[in-house]
Structures are given as structure tokens and as C-alpha cells.
């Protein structure tokens, strides 16, 4: 009984299409199979940056495969050709491994590349991320931001960029459409005439990095002797009801401090015929319902009762 | 006449650990991959895991992996998935599904009955 | 990972009547498709795998087309066994293997 073999695909490679870390992964069939023409090949493809522990994998019968990489790091790729036993009349085959890596030749020594990015998606609304300046750079350095999302025909440039003492430190982003539950990419890079600027790569959710607006109309309602209702409105926004957490810090007589993480927006206090001040905030924030990440509010404006006995009439300021 | 009996469903709290098997007879075990599918009450079918026919790849849903392990003795005829460190949200209906062609995974010609994993204190 | 949207989520009709059920893929899965039948309590049974080829036993009544990203379920004419919940699953790249989240054929 001959052993019957398989090649590796062939022209294994990882294109870079200029989408920021959105990498292409692409092959040839592997030579000589035309053995197994009444076959469906599939092909095992392991991928990872530089560094990281774990393998991703995946099996597929395409030629392709497209997926997310951080390209401050190097990527390693390997895949080999798959056969059922279908396929060889026997037991199932497979190729040795084909193997490529891919990496951007750094520019620059690492403390060049920006310090403390930090991005924010204002009330689901607007992007604006900022940064500081490299690392003993010169004042000629300036850094440009470039960002692609899927849906984009092509990475573009920062249009409008936050700037401080003539450098650029941060960008303002326009309206991004389609932009939310997908990775977003962001290349800061940077020149100046006297040294090379090392680039940075980032990727991240939108949703992820949401800061919504404080809660509004904030309210008093006596349910009972000894119950308050606290009642607040949904920031004006993008934002559906379903998607905030609420934190609400509550004050009596200058003394008591209740904290509480609500869903609604409403909040039930126990009280004594005794109080003679109420005072309440709240801030909110994207729940894990919508993202896996946020960002709390700022808190509300203060709202206060005091004066008159709180169990005499319904309060609302 | 292909057939697959599951078994090893109960009852079990959040944390603990169950194993499930897959008793399979009527075809050439050893030939084909074989995967595991669920289905919690009312609601559609998920993936969990794949195994290949010599058991050399494994493969699993992002909401299982590290925490269950697909294994197969085809000596046995037998599939198995071994589930640790259950939550709420793996209570369903599991079955065990032969694949008609593939390494992996592919069209699933013949499901086993299912068991039901219960995860609650 | 390829999602899977099956429309629509309930279907009424009534005996005889052709019946179409639509799965689209959020990115092209060429033909490697399959259809499942289930019935409540029931393990799903395989009607149509490779987006168009008739699983073995299963009533000819039943046919599947497309390829890409579109696909259709169609049944000729409908008949008193056929009301069940209908899953479409690709199986182009995985994991994850994913399903549609089921069209519930009911009577009218």
C-alpha cells in the first residue's frame, strides 16, 4: 500500500491592504491534486501575533482569510492542506506546515511613538481621541492619525486635529457611520526632520469606549410614610433606555451617604418622618447589554429638598 | 441503521462539572468527525465543538473554550465532552451530530436524541 | 465569524401552499450551506446540504438554491408534517460553526 501524501498549500503570504491591522491571509491550492479532483480540500490555518501564547485557528475551504492583527507586534501564520478520508479512500491526511510571518520595520526608537492614547466616544456620538507627544521629540515633531473601519473604501487621515503649541495632540473625528460592533483602527504616525518617528497601532469597539451625557430632570415623589421615589430622565442622545446602568449617590441631613447601581430609572429610598434634607445624584453608563466596556457619565446636577417635612407634599423641583 | 445515544445529562450547579457521552453504532465511527450542538429552551441552535475523525483537531465555540474539552475513544465508538466549570447559560439540550463529509465539521446528516444539562442552585 | 439571518422568523400558511424561507450570510460562503427540519422535542433532522443537494429519504417537495451569500429554502407544496422550525447552517469557515436563529412554519 503506497502512504498517500498531500503537499502544503502553495504561496502562503500575508498581504497588508493598508487597513491599519485588518490583514489579509491568502494561498494557492497545493501542487499535485489533482489526485483528489471528486475532493473537497480544506485547509487548517494557525495565526497569532508575536508573543501571544495561544494560536488562533481556523478550518476553511477558501483560498483566503481576513482578520485583526496589532501591528506594533509581528505576525506569524502557518497552514496546511486537510483531507477526509473520503478523499484517500482511508484514513484522513494531512499536509507539513507552510509558514510566512509578517511585520512593519519600525522607524524610530520606541519612546518616539506617542504616550497615553486616549480615546473616547462621546455620548455614542462623537470620537475624540488625544495623546501626548513622544519622549524627549523636538517641537518640529508633528503626528498624524489615520483610521479605517469595515466600510471604508481606504484609512483616512484626522481633518481636525486638537492642537498645542503647534502640535498635533489629539483628533476630533466626523460623524462615523456604520461604525459601532466592529474593530476600528487607529495608526498614529509621526515626522519630524531630525529623527524618525516610530508609529503606534491601535484597535478598539466604539461601543466599548462609550461616555454618556449625566441623567436629567432629576425628581422627588413621597410613595408613602417612610418611601421617596427618586425618578431621573435618559440623557438626550443616540442612547436607548435598555443600555444604561445608573450609580446614584444619595445624601440625608448632610450625614447619611447611600450609593446604589440601578437598571431603571428610578430608585426607592426608606426615609423617617425625621428628614428634614434630601440630596441625590446620578451618572450613567453603557451596560453589558449593548457593550462590554464604558465609560461613567459625569454626575448630574445636585438635587436637594430640605426645609419642609418631607412627608407633607409630593417634591419635584 | 446509524444511531447515537446520549447520555450524562443532570442536574448540576454553577461551577461543577458533568461529562457527556455519545455511544455511536451503524457506521464506521472511526472515519468521520463528529461535533456537539445545543440548544437552550426555547431559543435556536448553537455550536459547541468539533472533533476529527482520528481525533487530532479539536475545535470549539468561543463560550465553551477552556472550559469544555471534546475527546472521542473510537476503540469505543464513543464521543465525549467533558464540561467544567458550568454556568447558568450552558443549560440546554446537547446533542451529538455526525458530519456527512468534512475534516471538522460540515452538514450534520445524524443527530443523536439530545440531553438536557440543568445549571442551577 | 459568519453570521447567518433567516427570514422570516414565523411563517403562517396552509396546506399546499409554496413555501420559501431566505438565510443570507454576512459574507460569501459559496455553496456550503445546509437546511435542517426540527420538531418540538425532536432532534434536527438534514434536508439539504451543499446549498442544493437533497439529503437521502427526505421528500422531494424540498429544495434548496443559492450560493454567496443568498439562499433559499423552498417547499413546493406544503404538507401537514412540514410544520416545524427551520434552521439554515454554514459551513464554509470555522470555527465557529453558525446556524440561523430558525423560521417557524405554522399553520395559517
Known amino acids: 500500500d503506497t502512504e498517500i501524501k498531500v503537499n502544503p498549500p502553495q504561496d502562503f503570504e500575508i498581504v497588508d491592504p493598508g487597513y491599519l491591522g485588518y490583514l489579509y491571509l491568502q494561498w494557492q491550492p497545493p501542487l499535485s491534486l489533482d489526485h483528489f479532483k471528486e475532493c473537497t480540500v480544506e485547509y487548517e490555518l494557525k495565526y497569532r501575533n508575536i508573543g501571544s501564547e495561544t494560536w488562533k485557528t481556523i478550518i476553511t475551504k477558501n483560498l483566503h482569510y481576513k482578520d485583526g492583527f496589532d501591528l506594533n507586534k509581528g505576525i506569524e501564520a502557518k497552514i496546511h492542506t486537510l483531507l477526509p478520508w473520503q478523499c484517500t479512500n482511508g484514513s484522513e491526511v494531512q499536509s507539513s506546515w507552510a509558514e510566512t510571518t509578517y511585520w512593519i520595520s519600525p522607524q524610530g526608537i520606541p519612546e518616539t511613538k506617542v504616550q497615553d492614547m486616549d480615546c473616547v466616544y462621546y455620548n455614542w456620538q462623537y470620537l475624540l481621541c488625544s495623546w501626548k507627544p513622544g519622549i524627549g521629540v523636538l517641537l518640529d515633531t508633528n503626528y498624524n492619525l489615520f483610521y479605517w473601519y469595515e466600510g471604508l473604501d481606504h484609512a483616512l487621515q484626522c481633518v481636525d486635529y486638537i492642537k498645542a503649541d503647534g502640535q498635533n495632540i489629539g483628533c476630533r473625528f466626523p460623524y462615523l457611520e456604520a461604525s459601532d460592533y466592529k474593530d476600528f483602527y487607529i495608526c498614529v504616525n509621526g515626522s519630524s526632520e531630525n529623527k524618525p518617528i516610530r508609529s503606534s497601532y491601535f484597535t478598539f469597539q466604539l461601543q466599548n469606549i462609550v461616555k454618556p451625557l449625566p441623567p436629567v430632570y432629576l425628581t422627588f415623589t413621597r410613595e408613602s410614610s417612610c418611601e421617596i421615589k427618586l425618578k431621573w430622565s435618559i440623557p438626550l442622545g443616540p442612547i436607548p433606555a435598555r443600555c444604561f446602568d445608573y450609580e446614584i449617590e444619595i445624601r440625608e441631613d448632610d450625614t447619611t451617604l447611600v450609593t446604589a447601581t440601578v437598571e431603571n430609572e428610578t430608585y426607592t429610598l426608606k426615609t423617617t418622618n425625621e428628614t428634614r434634607q434630601l440630596c441625590f445624584v446620578v451618572r450613567s453608563k453603557v451596560n453589558i447589554y449593548c457593550s462590554d466596556d464604558g465609560i461613567w457619565s459625569e454626575w448630574s446636577d445636585k438635587q436637594c429638598w430640605e426645609g419642609e417635612d418631607l412627608s407633607k407634599k409630593t417634591l419635584l423641583r | 441503521e446509524v444511531q447515537l445515544l446520549e447520555s450524562g445529562g443532570g442536574l448540576v450547579q454553577p461551577g461543577g462539572s458533568l461529562r457527556l457521552s455519545c455511544a455511536a453504532s451503524g457506521f464506521t465511527f472511526s472515519r468521520y468527525a463528529m461535533n456537539w450542538v445545543r440548544q437552550a429552551p426555547g431559543k435556536g441552535l448553537e455550536w459547541v465543538s468539533a472533533?476529527?475523525?482520528?481525533?487530532?483537531?479539536?475545535y470549539y465555540a468561543d463560550s465553551v473554550k477552556g472550559r469544555f474539552t471534546i475527546s472521542r475513544d473510537n476503540s469505543k465508538n464513543t464521543l465525549y465532552l467533558q464540561m467544567n466549570s458550568l454556568r447558568a447559560e450552558d443549560t440546554a439540550v446537547y446533542y451529538c451530530?455526525?458530519?456527512?463529509?468534512?475534516w471538522g465539521a460540515g452538514a450534520f446528516d445524524y443527530w443523536g436524541q439530545g440531553t438536557l444539562v440543568t445549571v442551577s442552585s | 465569524d459568519i453570521q447567518m439571518t433567516q427570514s422570516p422568523s414565523t411563517l403562517s400558511a396552509s396546506v399546499g401552499d409554496r413555501v420559501t424561507i431566505t438565510c443570507r450570510a454576512s459574507?460569501?460562503?459559496?455553496?456550503?450551506l445546509a437546511w435542517y427540519q426540527q420538531k418540538p422535542g425532536k432532534a434536527p433532522k438534514l434536508l439539504i446540504y451543499d446549498a442544493s443537494s437533497l439529503e437521502s429519504g427526505v421528500p422531494s417537495r424540498f429544495s434548496g438554491s443559492g450560493s454567496g451569500t443568498e439562499f433559499t429554502l423552498t417547499i413546493s407544496s406544503l404538507q401537514p408534517d412540514d410544520f416545524a422550525t427551520y434552521y439554515c447552517q454554514q459551513y464554509d469557515t470555522y470555527p465557529p460553526i453558525t446556524f440561523g436563529q430558525g423560521t417557524k412554519v405554522e399553520i395559517k
Open positions: 472533533i476529527s475523525a482520528s481525533g487530532g483537531g479539536t
Open positions: 459574507q460569501s460562503i459559496s455553496s456550503w
Open positions: 451530530a455526525k458530519v456527512r463529509y468534512g
